[in-house]
């Protein structure tokens, strides 16, 4: 089976890397622009340079292209708490991040947010925090794995899932009120 | 078929409080981060809150950071808004959404779904 080309795909198919078809004239192969530039004028003819310019401030390509503008630059969101590891150039993006012990969580695929790495309080590190993922912490005896922090197991009521890992707890205070009564 | 009811809004004194809520149907709602937008008169929209699956990780926007508390209650594919210290400003139409997405270079996050929204309105 022919994998199913887009038209652009078709047109670029036709000549060699590196080169794309004329959109006025097919039996033209003009070569592409550099990355950190864009297309401001098909070749005129075989042999004759494509006419690139580099993009302006703001703007990048990050590889060879047949664009007709640039892209715009991505901008870090600071109420996401982004900041930014690396500035925009002509030939690449802004890379954006996250701060020392933070860790990105997704919103969705290229939108993430900045939280703090858990700490571990009342317990220990499982898996140490990662740049797309939290630490993964293992509570002491008497504590229990809420939102991936380790709280009392005082504050466990019997509706919740913390049952079973207070349930030595529990049944510990109900024997120490049940010893009072002879 | 997907369905986000939204309901609690009405009319409110400055520094009251509101809690909407909004009842999703026709998808797996536990599997699904839920968002609050709203839409102020002659405004556009702005993504207010978001919550995802578990209710470990919350979003904010800065104007009602500190006043607003998002949360769901998977057992009842149930999403929240809880409302405190309302000003003038926080007057809008309150959609609950789902399916964000968002690329660099065009700014605004878009959504998949919406509810047909609640009229939140803050006068004395």
């Known amino acids: 089976l022919v994998p199913h080309l887009g038209d652009r795909e078709k047109r670029d198919s036709v000549c060699p890397q590196g080169k794309y078809i004329h959109p006025q004239n097919n039996s033209i192969c003009c070569t592409k622009c550099h990355k950190g530039t864009y297309l401001y004028n098909d070749c005129p003819g075989p042999g004759q340079d494509t006419d690139c310019r580099e993009c302006e401030s703001g703007s990048f390509t990050a590889s060879e292209n047949h664009l007709r503008h640039c892209l715009s630059c991505s901008k870090c969101r600071k109420e996401m708490g982004q900041v930014e590891i690396s500035s925009c150039t002509v030939d690449r993006d802004t890379v954006c991040g996250c701060r020392k012990n933070q860790y990105r969580h997704y919103w969705s695929e290229n939108l993430f947010q900045c939280f703090n790495c858990s700490l571990c309080l009342n317990g220990t590190v499982h898996l140490s925090c990662q740049e797309k993922q939290n630490t993964v912490c293992t509570c002491h005896a008497g504590f229990f794995l809420r939102e991936n922090e380790c709280v009392s197991c005082s504050n466990c009521k019997k509706s919740l899932e913390c049952t079973k890992l207070c349930l030595p707890q529990i049944e510990n205070v109900k024997g120490t009120e049940d010893s009072g009564t002879t | 078929e997907v369905q986000l009811l939204e309901s609690g809004g009405g009319l409110v004194q400055p520094g009251g409080s509101l809690r909407l809520s909004c009842a999703a149907s026709?998808?797996?709602?536990?599997?699904?981060?839920m968002y609050w937008v709203r839409q102020a008169p002659g405004k556009g929209l702005e993504w207010v809150s978001g919550?995802?699956?578990?209710?470990?990780?919350?979003y904010y926007a800065d104007s009602v950071k500190g006043r607003f508390t998002i949360s769901r209650d998977n057992s009842k594919n149930t999403l929240y808004l809880q409302m405190n210290s309302l000003r003038a400003e926080d007057t809008a139409v309150y959609y609950c959404?789902?399916?964000?997405?968002?690329?660099?270079?065009?700014?605004?996050?878009?959504?998949?779904?919406w509810g047909q929204g609640t009229l939140v309105t803050v006068s004395s």
């Open positions: 959404a789902k399916g964000l997405h968002w690329s660099s270079d065009s700014g605004p996050v878009h959504f998949d779904y």
């Open positions: 919550i995802d699956t578990g209710g470990s990780h919350t």
């Open positions: 026709g998808f797996t709602f536990p599997t699904e981060h």
